[in-house]
């Protein structure tokens, strides 16, 4: 939050597009404008692609291919700057979801692969569960080649995958990708779905 009640969120989608959004509770029914630059000595440009919420501006989308520079921005109410800041946008990375996810079964193990993203410092996480698991199990690797062992071929397993930026590389402000679609497998073949995970029975109350 800022001193004037303007809450800012920055997301750098896959090192391609920067999204800056705000929650201007102190400025109801105002169309705040967004002005930005990537060099301190340049003049500000105004946003050309606004995000609207209930008919009012609530964010801006910027093309910023493979940028690791500072974004300088000013959010204004008319000509009055409401909030001015600069951020290293690289630290707000949200990788794209895993693409071309494929499964290779060999007895009681499966290797999940997908297309590696073009930049480094990422973790590829695969989660899986059977109807007997109340929570997802997880395994992650530095490349999108994750082998999960000791599975029961007779059980139906649901799988999903995502990409995370390593904190050691990108700091604490990143976002994990969205999950890939859940896919279900049993005996090495795809299934439309698995039975819902069983919830433990509630104890009966004695009279």
């Amino acid at each position: 939050a800022t001193g004037e009640g303007l809450q800012i969120q920055i997301i750098y989608f896959n090192l391609e597009t920067v999204q800056v959004t705000w929650n201007a509770s102190h400025y109801p029914r105002s169309n705040l404008s967004f002005h930005y630059k990537f060099s301190r000595d340049e003049a500000y440009d105004q946003c050309t692609v606004y995000i609207l919420q209930e008919g009012h501006t609530s964010g801006c989308l910027l093309d910023a291919e493979q940028q690791d520079d500072i974004l300088y921005f000013s959010i204004r109410n008319g000509t009055h700057p409401v909030f001015t800041a600069s951020r290293w946008i690289f630290y707000y990375l949200k990788p794209s979801s895993p693409k071309q996810v494929s499964f290779s079964w060999h007895q009681d193990a499966v290797t999940v692969t997908c297309s590696d993203l073009s930049y480094r410092g990422l973790l590829y996480e695969v989660q899986y569960r059977s109807p007997f698991d109340t929570e997802w199990q997880s395994k992650q690797e530095n490349t999108c080649n994750v082998t999960i062992e000791d599975l029961d071929a007779e059980k139906c397993y649901a799988f999903r995958a995502r990409v995370k930026a390593m904190e050691d590389a990108y700091g604490p402000d990143t976002y994990p990708s969205d999950w890939s679609e859940v896919t279900c497998w049993q005996r090495g073949e795809t299934r439309d779905s698995c039975p819902e995970p069983r919830t433990p029975p509630k104890p009966k109350l004695s009279k």
């Epitope: 001193g3 690791d68 520079d69 500072i70 001015t84 690289f90 630290y91 707000y92 700091g171």
Partner: antibody, heavy 118, light 107 residues
Framework: EVQLLESGGGLVQPGGSLRLSCAAS????????MHWVRQAPGKGLKWVSS????????YYADSVKGRFTISRDNPKNTLYLQMNSLRAEDTAVYYC???????????WGQGTLVTVSS | DIQMTQSPSSLSASVGDRVTITCRAS??????LAWFQQKPGKAPKSLIY???SLQSGVPSKFSGSGSGTDFTLTISSLQPEDFATYYC?????????FGQGTKVEIK
């Protein structure tokens, strides 16, 4: 463990040049923006310069713009500050600092002393 | 550039005292404020970031608060190792700027 080790400081005459180095370890150097901050004897801290992880983006305090150049060699995990046309007022301990996103200037080197005097 | 003003410039306190240092920014910096501790002949050490978050390994006797333009650093019970100079820094808007420092001395 994050470590930043500066070197290259020393005594130099006004108008002279010096190159400071900072050897980094314990984190993914190529992804981290880096900074130089200086402190004149008995004075406070002053930001000098910053560089983005790729080295493409460079930023300078007005007092050093045109005289100092920040750069980095990511394969060698090393940050540099090339200082030209040095002045007496550049005399300070120079610190190499790691950028931590919202965590700010989260790790500092031990510093290297630059003395500009005739 | 954003000016950062710390007060007091120096203070004398005893072991066990509660100490508060304030920092004021010349414009709204959200919560992008850090506090550093520096002992003579040593590098600064980061204590607090985003106004109130403790850096890893920093003891909980240090706390920070504030947002916008007014911030405080509190040491709940001063110990001998806490006698040092403390700096605030804004990193909301480039160039990053530091306060002039507050020297905490033994009474």
């Amino acid at each position: 463990e994050v470590q930043l080790l500066e070197s290259g400081g020393g005594l130099v005459q006004p108008g002279g040049s010096l190159r400071l180095s900072c050897a980094a370890s314990g984190f993914t150097f190529r992804s981290s923006a880096m900074h130089w901050v200086r402190q004149a004897p008995g004075k406070g801290l002053k930001w000098v310069s910053s560089v983005s992880g790729s080295g493409a983006g460079t930023y300078y305090a007005d007092s050093v713009k045109g005289r100092f150049t920040i750069s980095r060699d990511n394969p060698k995990n090393t940050l540099y500050l090339q200082m030209n046309s040095l002045r007496a007022e550049d005399t300070a301990v120079y610190y190499c600092v790691k950028e931590g996103g919202s965590r700010g200037f989260d790790y500092w080197g031990q510093g290297t002393l630059v003395t500009v005097s005739s | 550039d954003i000016q950062m003003t710390q007060s007091p410039s120096s203070l004398s306190a005893s072991v066990g005292d509660r100490v508060t240092i304030t920092c004021r920014a010349s414009q709204d910096i959200s919560n992008y404020l850090a506090w550093f501790q520096q002992k003579p002949g040593k590098a600064p050490k980061s204590l607090i970031y985003t106004a109130s978050s403790l850096q890893s390994g920093v003891p909980s006797k240090f706390s920070g608060s504030g947002s916008g333009t007014d911030f405080t650093l509190t040491i709940s019970s001063l110990q001998p190792e806490d006698f040092a100079t403390y700096y605030c820094q804004q990193y909301n808007l480039y160039p990053p700027t530091f306060g002039q420092g507050t020297k905490v001395e033994i009474k």
